[in-house]
């Protein structure tokens, strides 16, 4: 059990107050983290509270401002980037969001040597992506879907690609589906370690069907947003990878990197690129049917001026029980010999673990093992490998950082974080300086988050970077709910759950229950992290019990649980939520006449199916921006888990797993359906089809749309949304306003 430390003494009870919805909407109890912007083994940059950019040297203890807030303010800069030679800084302003990761901005180059902005050959605007070379001060940027190179900030640009066209050809940046579902970045270009070469992806969306929706704005006529968006089974983007020599780019021009023959024989994806050395690069490819991934190591042949990817350097990763990898196929972390690497993939027992690959995947040496999972490899040095896992005390929802000494034999393992602040900190990430000389640990909970700096050799804590003192003080008079993380064992399935209980929780009383669900493949909701959010308020002020349950299809507990949903989304995720609710009722403190479920996105799909399950368990529920049919969602994501919507593949389950097919079953529940009309991700179409099916079935329901809002329902819509959902739940649970 993880209980929030109670600060309530009887004498103080009248000074304590419950959380309010206003607290949540105002972000009163938000926390800060500190991620150093490392620029060497012992130096980092950080933007101070007053917006100066400060350079810290850990070894000398000195710090100095490299860029004043005055300079930042002069161009309204909201972000910055120091060139590796420390001569220039780019300043980013006019941030304009596009999709989840992508945005455009205006960039100014500031010359630190003379304290002036670089004049002449200024950058065009708006730029879609810009980055420094890893050495020196070359610049690569993407403007109007084409890539440009500057040898020095004041130099004129060299145009590398010329075929870029809006919504047609994307160079150096991903199209919608690659950004959201494959790369999870705003960029698709990669400098080699010393800046000799620049690799980039070209995405051709010419033949992709377009999703079109109205953006109402303020004009007399709405405008139409058009996005090439491949839904399940549709034509996909065609990807090519090129590499150009940045020293003399006008000579050879970009060289295309060959696709492995076994991949190129049918539809495929490019999944990631990792530079090993300036003349060796590693590309990862994936078949459209995403159970086969190929890692290809390519070498530059100076005499031919070409990239050679020998078959002997192709490593195949295949899943026979599900899809390849977890959410994404893992990326390799190369060792110092520049050919062998460490990679996370399933072991013979079906748990994701670190393996060391020297020649073939078949001969891989397993580095970690157990009925838990290695989650991320942070850094490999000459003698150590740093990774995170959920091994400690067998809680899947924790993250601790481990060090394996790979320089000694046999390798020894040490948990760096397990006992640092055991009650407060059970969920960590880390950020390492060059050669792992130093590292920052960022603890996300379950207590108040804290960021600390450590010596990479001894693991000794050097200093606290951020401990959220103000937050701690602000929470002193707040009655926070209690949280517990436990598990249910049902039919050989372990269902971990997090329960959020009202501050004065009494097991002998009956409470309304709200299930918050996400439940998507390879997700995890039950995590030992700190949060003061809407459900905290519902428990603290409105006296609800909130539960989150990780059922089949969720991550970090082995392939049996993860791949259980393969090719049949919408079945077991829903079953497991229902099973958990039944178990919660058996615990005796749940009012079984007041049970609700809510979720967003995939969670909206699961909550809708749970409400329409015909069990009579749920009185009401909310679906925010739900998927309603897998035929409406993106190919890359959907097909990974469902295969293709064709007769000879999995069309039958595509049809059986829609929300619309269960319209009749909503008759006996109160359903609130919510969606943004400008949702580029889960299109409004999904909710439009649910609404149509419910109307056709003559089923009453409630709905709310948010005009011109995307999948995140941000800004004022957030306030409206949570206020609206609160009213709905209070009404459902007969709670007075």
């Amino acid at each position: 059990i993880v209980l929030r430390p109670s600060r309530v003494h009887n004498s103080e009870e009248n000074t304590m107050r419950a959380l309010t919805l206003k607290d949540i909407l105002n972000g009163t109890f938000s926390y800060k983290t500190f991620f150093p912007n490392w620029i060497s083994g012992q130096e980092y940059l950080h933007q101070s509270a007053d917006n100066n950019i400060v350079l810290y040297n850990i070894e000398t203890g000195q710090s100095y401002t490299i860029l004043s807030n005055r300079t930042m303010k002069s161009v309204n800069a909201s972000n910055y980037g120091l060139s590796p030679d420390r001569q220039f800084v780019y300043l980013e302003s006019d941030y304009s969001k596009l999709w989840r990761y992508s945005y455009t901005a205006t960039y100014y180059i500031y010359d630190l040597s003379n304290g002036e902005f670089v004049r002449g050959n200024e950058l065009p605007r708006p730029i879609q992506y810009l980055c420094w070379s890893p050495v020196g001060s070359k610049l690569a940027y993407v403007y109007q879907n084409n890539i440009y190179l500057k040898q020095r900030p004041g130099d004129p640009p060299f145009q590398i690609t010329f075929n870029g066209r809006e919504n047609k050809i994307f160079n150096g940046i991903p199209d919608w589906v690659y950004e959201e579902e494959m790369l999870a970045t705003k960029y698709a270009l990669w400098w080699s370690p010393n800046g000799k070469f620049l690799a980039y992806a070209e995405f051709n969306d010419t033949d992709i069907p377009v999703i079109a929706y109205s953006y109402y704005g303020d004009e007399q006529y709405p405008r139409t947003i058009n996005i090439p968006y491949p839904k399940a089974g549709a034509k996909n983007p065609v990807v090519r990878i090129f590499i150009i020599d940045t020293t003399y780019p006008a000579y050879v021009g970009p060289q295309e990197v060959p696709v492995p023959a076994m991949i190129a024989s049918s539809d495929y994806y490019f999944s990631w690129l990792t530079w090993v050395t300036d003349e060796r690069v590693c590309l990862q490819w994936l078949k459209r049917v995403q159970n086969v991934s190929v890692l290809s190591i390519c070498d530059f042949r100076e005499d031919w001026q070409t990239w050679d990817c020998p078959k002997t350097q192709e490593h195949i990763e295949e899943s026979r029980t599900g899809w390849a990898g977890g959410f994404f196929v893992s990326t390799p972390v190369f060792s110092y010999d520049a050919i062998s690497y460490y990679k996370i993939f399933s072991d013979k027992d079906g748990y994701k673990h670190i393996h060391y690959i020297k020649d073939t995947v078949e001969n891989a040496i397993q580095i970690t093992s157990g009925k838990w999972e290695a989650i991320n490899i942070f850094r490999v040095t000459q003698d150590s490998l740093f990774y995170s896992s959920n091994e400690f005390e067998e809680y899947p929802g924790r993250r601790n950082i481990y060090r394996i000494s790979i320089g000694s034999y046999p390798p020894s393992k040490k948990c760096v974080t397990c006992h640092l602040r055991k009650e407060r900190c059970q969920y960590y990430t880390a950020s390492f300086s060059d050669y792992a000389k130093y590292y920052a640990l960022v603890c996300y909970g379950p207590g108040i988050p804290i960021s600390t700096l450590h010596d990479g050799r001894t693991d000794q804590e050097i200093k606290i970077l951020e401990e959220n003192k103000e937050l701690e003080n602000a929470l002193k008079n707040i009655q926070l709910p209690k949280e517990e993380i436990k598990k249910l064992e049902v039919d050989e399935i372990t269902l971990w759950y997090k329960m959020i209980l009202p501050p004065q929780f009494d097991r002998s009383k009956k409470y309304p229950l709200l299930i918050q669900v996400y439940g998507g493949p390879c997700s995890q909701s039950v995590r030992s992290v700190f949060a003061v959010n809407w459900i905290s308020y519902l428990a603290s002020k409105e006296g609800m019990v909130i539960a989150l349950v990780d059922g089949r299809g969720t991550a970090f507990q082995g392939d049996k649980l993860l791949y259980a949903v393969y090719r049949k989304l919408g079945v077991y995720e829903v079953e497991d939520q229902i099973t958990a609710v039944r178990k919660f009722i058996e615990m005796g403190f749940i009012d079984e006449k007041r049970i609700a479920i809510w979720g967003w996105s995939y969670g909206g799909y699961v909550s809708s199916l749970a409400l329409a399950s015909g069990t009579g368990l749920f009185k009401c529920g909310i679906a925010v921006a739900p998927v309603s049919s897998w035929e409406y969602y993106a190919s890359v994501y959907t097909e990974r888990f469902m295969g293709l919507p064709t007769k000879d593949d999995n069309l039958e389950h595509y049809k059986n797993s829609t929300v619309m097919a269960r319209a009749e079953y909503f008759r006996n529940v109160d359903y609130l359906l919510i969606h943004g009309t400008a949702d580029d991700n889960v299109h409004f179409q999904n909710s439009a089809q649910i609404a149509k099916a419910l109307v056709n079935a003559q089923v009453d329901f409630q709905a709310m749309w948010y005009s011109d809002q995307n999948h995140g329902l941000s800004g004022l819509s957030t306030n409206h949304l949570y206020t609206h959902m609160t009213h709905f739940l209070k009404q459902c649970f007969s709670l007075s306003d």
């Epitope: 004129p156 020293t247 000579y251 060289q255 070409t306």
Partner: antibody, heavy 116, light 108 residues
Framework: EVQLLESGGGLVQPGGSLRLSCAAS????????MSWVRQAPGKGLEWVSA???????YYADSVKGRFTISRDNSKNTLYLQMNSLRAEDTAVYYC??????????WGQGTLVTVSS | EIVLTQSPGTLSLSPGERATLSCRAS???????LAWYQQKPGQAPRLLII???TRATGIPDRFSGSGSGTDFTLTISRLEPEDFAVYYC?????????FGQGTKVEIK
């Protein structure tokens, strides 16, 4: 030893067509960008067209829509299909190794004369 | 397009003398994209200098290049009889790549 050998030049009437070839040897042709550069009699050099190893084509405005550059990597040969020829296209046509600059190897050239 | 203007049009010098050829661009050219070529009558051009100052393979060290921005120079420190030819500068910064009109180095 790198060698580039042009052929296909000759006398052609205005409006006529001609196809130039450039046979390459001594290097991995399939992995190099190639260009055509011309030189009118007694004049300077003028870049005409280029093609990446992967096939993307680039043209000078003066020939766009009339000339087509192509390559056959299996034959190690570069081509320039010239249509709607004009008197001002009269020149020695060189094939050169390179995209937009650093043309490190050139053929001996082939003369194209456009005249009625 | 970028216009490259070479001067002088003709340079009359004796063997053993120093030749200084100028190339001026109508707009800024990054050093990486500036090359020099030599052409003798009835022959194809030959690459001399890349990146404004780096000698191409097999080019003797009496040839040197310098300059940046809009002004570039090719210097032949001591003219040899075989150096009498036409010299072209060329930019590959933007499409179309362009050549200067040439400087003829002739025997005085």
């Amino acid at each position: 030893e790198v060698q580039l050998l042009e052929s296909g030049g000759g006398l052609v009437q205005p409006g006529g067509s001609l196809r130039l070839s450039c046979a390459a040897s001594g290097f991995t042709f399939s992995s190099h960008a190639m260009s055509w550069v011309r030189q009118a009699p007694g004049k300077g050099l003028e870049w005409v067209s280029a093609i990446w190893a992967s096939g993307e084509q680039y043209y000078a405005d003066s020939v766009k829509g009339r000339f087509t550059i192509s390559r056959d990597n299996s034959k190690n040969t570069l081509y320039l299909q010239m249509n709607s020829l004009r008197a001002e296209d009269t020149a020695v046509y060189y094939c050169a190794k390179g995209w937009l600059g650093n043309f490190d190897y050139w053929g001996q050239g082939t003369l194209v004369t456009v005249s009625s | 397009e970028i216009v490259l203007t070479q001067s002088p049009g003709t340079l009359s010098l004796s063997p053993g003398e120093r030749a200084t050829l100028s190339c001026r661009a109508s707009q800024s050219v990054s050093r990486s994209y500036l090359a020099w070529y030599q052409q003798k009558p009835g022959q194809a051009p030959r690459l001399l200098i890349i990146g404004a100052s780096t000698r191409a393979t097999g080019i003797p060290d009496r040839f040197s290049g310098s300059g940046s921005g809009t002004d570039f120079t090719l210097t032949i420190s001591r003219l040899e009889p075989e150096d009498f030819a036409v010299y072209y500068c060329q930019q590959g910064q933007v499409i179309p790549p362009t050549f200067g009109q040439g400087t003829k180095v002739e025997i005085k």
